[in-house]
Interface confidence: low
């Protein structure tokens, strides 16, 4: 039985504080009382806590604990969210500028083929861009297409300019001639090369930083148990109760309540630093074919090797696809 | 080589990009969040630290609070006391994570995975076969000028030289965080949190 | 110093012919874009017409297509604008301009116009 | 023919902030600004939606966002009083100006 309170002890600094943590509930005592009900601050003496009080002691804790870890980790949150827009807006930037810059290849070197051209580049490089937002494509088909939609273009305007506008017939067998015929030579290989080891770099990179947002997240709104809100109550709420305001925890105290707290949260450690580290990898490899922005601005100028490389072999090539689409082509005249 | 027709004003050796040396590329850009995200790397290891730091806690007072009752601030009650007769501590500790923490970790461990193996040297045979195809020089290894693959010895050096930055309306200096200037920190309003 | 001059404006009836000229020095002439750009009295700018640096490219305003004709001499440093059937519209400032190119050397389409002539005026009144 | 348009007039006091709208650019282009001062050339200003050439004031600013640009204006001085273009590029990459804004410093 714990010694009676001094006659003229009251509540009322108690009372004062509680007020502001739940203003204009009666729960506070006006004396202290033995407190035979406290089942988290148990009482060594009269206490000026009631059930109830205790109940709200533990829920402001555990809030205060929710939001000592957002603002632990605000500045981490900011950098990787800011970072992520960032490098989505300048991913889809380089996009656009590798976009107009082959645009203006065209039309500053083969001003015949542009209407098209620019119709053909601006869905590979659309392309391009969903890629890299994760879009289920795959680049070796986008650079196909690429190159499957400019030859009939090529043919008939560059290489075959007495022809009548082209017919699908015509198109058909020029599309299946470029590839069969390799007219572009190695180009499109190494593009397909450059262009999906880039992207796939850049694809990665996006999602990590995508990932690393959810980590902090989820680690950000962890609700806490039970448990440890009665820890939490204990060592920031329980002196209150005797009437010890100005009291503060012992620092080696609050660590051993943190740690029991963030048990969970923190064998996410080993992993995090591994990201971090892996991530780090990752960018010191970005560079020359695993560099998007290096890649997609120079597209421009290898495609324009490419279309020199087929008007290299115009010849040739206008003699082998006479024969090979001399059917379509006769379909066509008639 | 391939020949470039005059109005690409191409530079046979060095395509010459008039751009300043300290505008931040793309490539630089990545490296500064590397270096700022390492000094986060024991971020989970340290929660529990930064937290305390973060709330009151008796720092140069004489007597402290351990759970139970007031006591020296360098006594061994300090720390032990107040986790007598209490629940088991190691017992929330055997917990184990939450199922939201347990699900996130299978995540880091799978970008982890394929980070690695998007690093890996081993998945970087390309550069040789490229070079065996006559596409790529080997004389591009500088920091700052990189490669692109022209055609067999036309090889053309181009600077990294989006100058991204200067299109996006961010600005990434932690100092302006907003977390900087948060209001309802437990620091910035501890009457509604800690009386101190 | 970087520098553009035309010459060549007047008066002149509709229906007539003008040549403009624009010399330039103080940059590679060869290696840029030039573009002509007007401005009728009291209005805005218009662009009118722009040639690649070899000269093989040509491009013009609707409203000059078929009548102007832009070309230039890289070994003179200078750029043209042979300007035929005029009309009382075309009365104007006629500015030559250099393409501004920061990146890409080549890139002289989208950049803007770093360098401008002080302008030649164009008249076409009966 | 794409059409950039721009407010006619613009003011604001010495020493205020101003900005200058430009809307309808929508090929992808980047927008340039030109500062026109009486009776003289246009003069390139920001290009590339909000880089200055060397010599232009930090006072003046550029910047982008979707289908308009805007030129932010810090400090005003008389010496700023002028017509002010925003350009940009049509689909077939041929130049194309806004209407003009006269900005007065009152």
């Known amino acids: 039985q714990p010694p009676p309170p001094p006659p003229d002890a009251t509540c009322h600094q108690v009372r004062s504080f509680f007020q502001r943590l739940q203003p204009g509930l009666k729960w506070v005592p006006e004396t202290p009382v033995p407190g035979s009900d406290l089942q988290v601050c148990l009482p060594k003496g009269p206490t000026c806590c009631s059930r109830k009080m205790e109940e709200k002691y533990q829920l402001t804790a555990r809030l205060n604990m929710e939001q000592l870890l957002q603002s632990a980790s605000m500045e981490l949150k900011f950098l990787i969210i800011q970072n992520a827009a960032v490098f989505q807006e300048a991913f889809e930037i380089v996009v656009r500028h590798a976009k107009n810059y082959t645009n203006a290849m065209f039309k500053n070197n083969y001003p015949s083929l542009t209407p098209q051209a620019f119709e053909f580049v601006g869905e590979f490089f659309t392309d391009v861009s969903l890629y890299i937002l994760g879009s289920d494509i795959n680049v070796d088909d986008m650079v196909n297409e690429l190159f499957d939609s400019l030859f009939p273009v090529i043919y008939t305007q560059l290489m075959n300019p007495g022809l009548p506008d082209s017919a699908l017939d015509i198109n058909e067998c020029l599309r299946g001639a470029r590839r069969d015929l390799k007219v572009f030579g190695n180009f499109p290989k190494l593009i397909m090369t450059q262009v999906s080891k880039s992207l796939q770099v850049t694809r990665i990179f996006l999602q990590a930083l995508n990932l690393g947002i959810e980590v902090i997240n989820t680690t950000d709104h962890l609700k806490f148990s039970k448990d440890c809100g009665r820890m939490l109550t204990r060592m920031w709420y329980c002196s209150y109760c005797q009437g010890l305001m100005m009291v503060k925890p012992c620092g080696g105290y609050c660590n051993v309540v943190m740690q029991g707290c963030m048990a969970g949260v923190v064998e996410i450690d080993k992993y995090w630093r591994e990201y971090i580290l892996s991530l780090e990898e990752l960018v010191n490899g970005m560079y020359r074919i695993y560099d998007m922005e290096n890649v997609l601005l120079g597209l421009f100028s290898t495609i324009h090797d490419s279309i020199q490389y087929v008007q290299k072999n115009a010849g040739k090539l206008t003699t082998t696809i006479g024969k090979l689409c001399a059917h379509s082509q006769q379909r066509q005249y008639r | 080589s391939a020949y470039y027709p005059e109005d690409l004003f191409i530079d046979k050796k060095v395509l010459k990009v008039a751009h300043v040396e300290h505008e931040e590329t793309l490539s630089s850009r990545r490296r500064e969040l590397i270096q700022k995200l390492k000094s986060f790397i024991s971020f989970y290891s340290a929660l529990p630290g930064y937290i305390c730091s973060h709330s009151p806690v008796a720092e140069n007072d004489t007597l402290c609070w351990n759970g139970q009752e007031l006591v020296e601030r360098y006594s061994q009650k300090a720390a032990r006391n107040g986790m007598k007769n209490q629940f088991n501590l190691h017992e929330l500790k055997m917990k184990g994570p939450e199922p939201v923490v347990s699900q996130i970790i299978d995540k880091l461990k799978h970008i982890n995975q394929l980070l690695r193996t998007m690093s890996m040297p081993k998945g970087r045979v390309l550069d040789k076969n490229l070079d065996e195809e006559g596409f790529e020089s080997g004389d591009c290894g500088d920091d700052e000028d990189e490669c692109i693959g022209g055609s067999g010895d036309g090889m053309i050096k181009v600077k990294n030289q989006l100058r991204f930055l200067a299109e996006l309306a961010y600005d990434l200096d932690v100092d302006d965080a907003p977390g900087n200037s948060q209001q309802a920190t437990p620091k910035d309003n501890e009457i509604s949190t800690f009386h101190n | 110093e970087v520098q553009l001059v035309e010459s060549g404006g007047g008066l002149v009836q509709p229906g007539g012919s003008l040549r403009l000229s624009c010399a330039a020095s103080?940059?590679?002439?060869?290696?840029?874009?030039m573009s002509w750009v007007r401005q009728a009295p009291g209005k805005g700018l218009e662009w009118v017409s722009s040639v690649s640096s070899s000269g093989t490219g040509t491009y013009y305003a609707d409203s000059v297509k078929g009548r102007f004709t832009i070309s230039r001499d890289n070994s003179k440093n200078t750029l043209y604008l042979q300007m035929n059937s005029l009309r009382a519209e075309d009365t104007a400032v006629y500015y030559c301009a250099k393409e501004y190119d920061y990146g890409l050397g080549w890139m002289h389409y989208y950049y803007g116009m770093d360098v401008w002539g002080q302008g030649t005026t164009v008249t076409v009144s009966s | 023919q794409s059409v950039l348009t721009q407010p006619p007039s613009v003011s604001g006091a010495p020493g205020q902030r101003v900005t200058i709208s430009c809307t309808g650019s929508s090929s992808g282009y980047d927008v340039h600004w030109y500062q026109q001062l009486p009776g003289r050339a246009p003069k390139l200003l920001i290009y590339?939606?909000?880089n200055r050439p060397s010599g232009v004031p930090d006072r003046f600013s550029g910047s982008n966002s979707g289908t308009s640009a805007s030129l932010a204006i810090t400090g005003l001085q008389a010496e700023d009083e002028a017509d002010y273009y925003c350009q940009s590029y049509d689909s077939s990459l041929n130049a194309i100006f806004g209407g003009g804004t006269k900005l007065t410093v009152l």
């Open positions: 590339g939606s909000n």
């Open positions: 103080g940059f590679t002439f060869k290696r840029y874009a």
